[in-house]
Every structure is written in C-alpha cells, then in structure tokens.
Interface confidence: medium
C-alpha cells in the first residue's frame, strides 16, 4: 500500500507516544555530543509536524521521505560544525548519501562517563514531577552511549524502568528497592546493545545471507515445531526489521516488527505451542516476550538427518540446483535437532558440509566422497566443548575477578598493540562467561558461552575497527563471523611484540582509589595489569601473580593508612621498583 | 496441518493420456516438495516424479521419464501429474504426498513424506 505521507503513515501506526520517543532516540544516536534540551525539542517539533501531515496528508513537506525530513532536522543544529567537525559535511549531500555518511559518524565508545544515579529522593521528586520527560532523559543518555541500540527494545526498556520507579518510589526504603532493580535492568540493557551491536556488524560487514543464516540456525532451535517454510518467512521479516534498525529507520523497524509480532501471533499454531502467553501482551511487552521465548519442545518423529543429506541419490542435483536453499534447509534441519549448540557451531557445521559438497559433487563418485561428512563434524563439535569445559573449571578455580584476569594476560599477550582500557572492557566482560554460563546445565553450557563470546569478540572488533592497530585482530575480525571466536582463540603470543617504555606515571596511585566502587577498584587494578604486561611480555603467571599479590596488599594498607595519600607516595614507588626487579 | 486431495484417475486405454490433479491447504504450498507416488495391487509404494519448493527442480523415475511431467500451480496450490502414452503396468492407486519444510528435497522415500493424500485409481486397459 502506497502512502501519501510516509510520516503520518508511521505517526499512525505508532502512536504519539511511541513516535516521539523513537524520534527522540533516533536523533540521540546520530548526534551523541548535542544535550538533552536540544533533542527533546528537534523531536517535539518533529512530532508536531508529524501530526499535522496526519490530520492533512497533503500537507506542506508531508510528502518527503523520512530522511530528508530527518536529515533536514540535524542540519538545522547551530553546533553542527563545532561540535561534530566533519560530520557537518554531511549536510552538503543529497539523500540517500547524507542518511549513509550521518551513519558512519556514529561513534561506538563516545567516552562519556558512566550514568552515576543521584539520591534516590532527587529521582523520585524528579520522576514524579514529569515522568515524560524523566523517561525521555533515560532514552536519551542509553541511546548516545550506545548508537546501534535496538530503539524498539529501549522503548521496552524506558517502560521497565517506568515501572520500577513506580513501585520503589512508595517504598519505604526507596534505595533498597531501586538498587538492585536498577542494577539488573542496566545489566540487561548492557547485554541488549552489545546483541544489537553485534547484529548490526553482521548485517554491515558480512551481509543479508550472514545474517540470515544465523537467525535461521536460532529460531530453528527456539521453533523445532515449525516448518521451515515458516521459518523462512519470520527469518525474511526479522532481517528486514533489523536492516531498518541498524539503518537508523526506527520508525520502520519499530513498525515492521510490530507487524511481525502480530504474524506470529496469528500464526502461532505452526510456529510453537510457546507463544501464547506472549500473544496476550500489548505490544513492547509482546515483541519482547516473543524475542526471549523459551524454547518449543522437539517434535518426537524427526527422521534421521542421513536420508537426505547424505544417502538421497540427489543430493549433488538438490544443492547444484540452489544452493542456499538447500544449505538453509541443512542449518535448519540440523539446528532443531541441536539446541544444545551454539549458533556459531551450526553455522560452522553447515560451511564444512557445504565445502564438501564442493568438493564431492565435482567428483566421478559423489555419494562415495561425501558418505562420511556427518562423521567429519565431530572435531569442529569437540572444540568448542572443550574449550567450554576448560574454561569453566578455570572460572570455577579462580571466581569472575580472577578469571578475568587470566583472560586479561591471555588476551593482552594475544595482542599487546590494543589499546588497555579496550583490553580491560573485553576482558571483563569475556570474564562475565562464566558467571553467565557455567552454572548452567551442561546442555546450555556451549550455547550460551559461545554466543555470548561472539557478541564481546564483537565489541573487541568494533573498538578495534576505529583505530586498528593489530593485523592479526584485523585477521580475526574480517576474515569470517562464524570463526571469529575460534580465530581469537588460536592466536598464541605476538612474538613481534616490542616492549613498551616504562612509565611510572601509569603506577602512579592516589587515595581517591579507597573510595571508589568495588567494580572501578578492579578496573584500576586491572588496568596497571595490562601495563605490567604491555612492559614486560614475557612475564611468567606466577610473577605476575605475586606482583598483583603485592599491589593488593599495597592498596588495602595504604587505604587503611591514616594518611593516605602520603602511604601511596611513598610505597607506590617501591611497589613498582619491587614489580620491576621481581620480572626482569 | 496439510491437508491433499487427488482427482483426475479414471480408465484409460494403452497409448493414451490423463492428467492428475492434486490441490492443497498449505499457505506455503508452494515452497514445499510435493511427489508423486503410486501403489499396484500387492506391490509397495513406488516413486513416480517430485518437484521442489522455490525453484521447480524435477525429478522422475526411471519408468515414467519422458512420459509423464509434473508441474504445479502456485496460484491455485495444486500439483498436476500429467501423464502420456499410458501403459498396462502404470494401472494403480496414485499419490500425492508433501514434505513441509524440505523445500528442495524430493525424496524417493515414501516413509519421508507426513502428508498424503486419500489416492485416486488409474487404470490402463484396452
């Protein structure tokens, strides 16, 4: 259907509500650097235009694309030029350049520091005194620190942390409610944007059949039940939805997966018996519901895999014929059989039958050449298993912190050239596997390490991809999606490595450490890890063990010290001249 | 859930033609592999011709090919079996089967296919 005014189109289908906080979070992530006041005004009159073409279609300007109009909207900002440097350039172009060249002005890791909550009384007062606007506020400074976030799945998310004001702030002890509320909430946030980071890089760097691909191997093991036809059809309309989205369409993508939610309700009889208490939710809270649905149980009949894929006489003829057809219905059939393994697996398990029949079908005796590939998979399911287990043993050994420092030294000697606060980031949260995935049972185990490591490796890559620095990160990042993880794994020492210069500057500490938060204690702490190492390389585990033993002990006793900041100046050089003769 | 239904059987003499009918409710019909399959009196189910989903990719059996075709009407969701220079021991029930999900795999295997059809009789005789 054929609209006159796009704009009222989606102000239509959206709601106001809906429209303006899109807008609002639309306008955030292109111009991370402007302040709230700015974009609550751009998206206000935005709003007001957008009702004015609904109410009178023929409207002046109601006829433009969403880009032009968009556009337009951010070339109209005074600070363009001072604020953004070159991105003001992108005003000089026409559509569709002017969308593409704001897109690639989006900056992954702004700098800006990390969201301090005020006094539970003051968020109150100020939540009750305009909730609009302190909602608002909340999208705003989610959606500039994080520019690629899924801006349907934010609107979800303000209405979480609607709630939860609502409720901790009748509460007697309003900090005791909001804390550990607030705390998960931001927990799953975090999680949500590197998802959709992750997505995104998919859709960017490697393409619609990437991502395609992935999302079948998913919602296969999500909906074994449904047919792959079915799975076909909700795969084409949440690649669109997502394309919009990492596109900056949010009004689109915000429309277009409220439309697929309703298919699936409508259609939930073929595509798993799991949906229904979904289905009875408006629509955030529906969507969401369908996106983390638990998984259908396994039809009980499912013929084995070897009829088709290896003994059908026609196996050569199916896959000539289309191949990714034929592929899609292989990750699909072996998907739902597999819900204990990761996507990245089944997505490496369909490239190597793939590569084999490459291989087979351009021989004299195909069926004879690909009879074994089943049995060929076994290595590529060993590995990631493998590591798995290891890796949880370790968590288990040493708890997150320490883990995180294992993973720390591993990945610094993997590559040095990266930048320490990228080191620590991923490092963290690579750490944070294991806490999420170990306690699992053993049939989750692999899925949810996996997929998880592929979602961090993402953010190493897109870190890296700004400054680059590290071939052998360039390697990991670009050569394949599916084998980032296996590639960072693989890499050994960079021997080629040349030793940083020591500066004392970088161990110089100061008493304000004693009083910062557990979280930034370690990340200090980890941060002067990663320098230890980019110093001396080829430091030993148990060297640098007893230093970070000692520089433990020296942070405890000077935080306990009567002065302070004189036990730092004064012990702080020793610490670092005992550091240095204790790894030469 | 699939539901088939064949028509077109009949009696015919050596020589001539019929052409089968197979019409289906499945909204993704046409992304689907339907076959032929036909069963003489105390003989097993044999294969007769299949087509994939998506891309009409057509396979027959060696005792049909060059004699019968199989095509499809997407818009209409019915598969045809059209069938030249009929012979005695083409006499039998004839099948149309479907396999959901397997857009391109047409399958020899009768056990492979969860949806049949209730058959329609052709007979060859003079």
């Known amino acids: 259907e054929a609209y006159k005014s796009e704009i009222a189109h989606r102000y239509n289908d959206l709601g106001e509500e809906h429209f303006r906080g899109l807008v609002l979070v639309a306008f955030s992530q292109y111009l991370q650097q402007c302040p709230f006041e700015d974009h609550v005004k751009l998206a206000k009159e935005v709003t007001e235009f957008a009702k004015a073409c609904a109410a009178e279609e023929s409207g002046a300007n109601c006829d433009k694309s969403l880009h032009t109009l968009f556009g337009d909207k951010l070339c109209t900002v005074a600070s363009l030029r001072d604020k953004y440097g070159d991105m003001a350039d992108c005003c000089e172009k026409q559509e569709p350049d002017r969308n593409e060249c704001f897109l690639a002005h989006k900056d992954d890791n702004p700098g800006f520091p990390p969201l301090v909550a005020p006094e539970p009384d003051a968020l109150c007062a100020a939540f009750q005194d305009n909730e609009q606007l302190f909602l608002g506020k909340y999208l705003y400074e989610i959606a500039r620190r994080h520019p690629y976030f899924y801006a349907p799945e934010l609107l979800y998310y303000a209405q979480q942390y609607k709630g939860v004001f609502a409720e901790c702030c009748q509460a007697a002890d309003k900090a005791a409610c909001l804390g550990p509320k607030i705390e998960a909430l931001r927990e799953k946030v975090l999680l949500s944007s590197a998802k959709e980071r992750f997505k995104c890089a998919s859709l960017q760097k490697f393409g619609d059949r990437a991502f395609k691909a992935w999302s079948v191997a998913r919602l296969s093991q999500r909906f074994p039940k449904a047919d792959f036809a079915e799975i076909s059809k909700v795969v084409t309309d949440l690649t669109k939805v997502h394309k919009e989205c990492c596109h900056g369409d949010l009004l689109e993508c915000a429309d277009d997966r409220a439309d697929l939610a309703k298919y699936m309700c409508e259609n939930q009889d073929s595509i798993s018996t799991k949906l229904k208490e979904c289905c009875d939710k408006p629509v955030l809270e529906k969507s969401q519901c369908l996106a983390e649905v638990e998984r259908d149980e396994l039809p009980g009949d499912l013929p084995s895999l070897a009829a088709d894929f290896v003994e059908d006489k026609e196996v050569c003829k199916n896959y000539q014929e289309a191949k990714d057809v034929f592929l899609g219905t292989f990750l699909y059939e072996y998907a739902r059989r597999h819900p204990e393994y990761s996507v990245s697996l089944l997505l490496r398990l369909a490239k190597e039958y793939e590569a084999t029949l490459e291989k087979c079908c351009a021989t004299d005796d195909p069926p004879t050449c690909y009879a074994k590939v089943l049995d060929e998979f076994k290595p590529l399911v060993d590995e990631p298993q493998n590591l798995v287990k290891t890796n949880c043993e370790l968590f288990e050994k040493l708890g997150e912190y320490g883990f995180q420092n294992a993973l720390l030294v591993r990945y610094t000697k993997k590559a040095p050239q990266v930048s320490t606060p990228t080191l620590v980031e991923v490092s963290r949260k690579l750490g944070k596997v294991g806490t999420k995935c170990c306690k699992k049972p053993e049939s989750e185990r692999m899925s949810c390490a996996e997929d998880f490591l592929s979602v961090v490796l993402n953010r190493l890559c897109v870190l890296h991809e700004k400054t680059p620095v590290s071939e052998r990160v360039t390697k990991c990042c670009s050569e394949s999606l599916v084998n980032r993880r296996p590639c960072f794994s693989g890499l050994e020492v960079d021997e080629t490595y040349v030793p940083k210069e020591f500066n004392a500057e970088t161990f110089t500490f100061h008493a304000d450490l004693c009083t910062l938060p557990e979280a930034e204690k370690q990340v200090k702490k980890q941060t002067a890890l990663v320098e230890l190492l980019k110093h001396k390389p080829k430091a030993t585990d148990e060297q640098l063990k007893t230093v970070m033993g000692d520089f433990g002990a020296f942070v405890e006793k000077c935080c306990a010290a009567e002065n302070k900041e004189g036990c730092f100046s004064e012990e702080g050089p020793k610490l670092v001249a005992a550091a240095q003769a204790a790894l030469v | 859930e699939v539901q088939l239904l064949e028509s077109g059987g009949g009696l015919v003499q050596p020589g001539g033609s019929l052409r089968l009918s197979c019409a289906a409710s499945y909204r993704y019909i046409d992304e689907t592999a339907v076959a032929w399959f036909r069963q003489a009196p105390g003989k097993e189910r044999e294969f007769v011709a299949g087509i994939g989903g998506g891309v009409d990719i057509t396979y027959y059996a060696d005792s049909v090919k060059g004699r019968f075709t199989i095509s499809r009407d997407n818009s209409k969701n019915t598969l045809y079996l059209q069938m030249n220079s009929l012979r005695p021991e083409d006499t039998a029930v004839y099948y149309c089967?479907?396999?959901?999900?397997?857009?391109?795999?047409?399958?020899?295997?009768?056990?492979?296919?969860?949806?049949w059809g209730q058959g329609t009789l052709v007979t060859v005789s003079s």
């Open positions: 089967a479907a396999r959901p999900g397997r857009p391109l795999i047409t399958s020899k295997v009768a056990d492979l296919y969860p949806y």
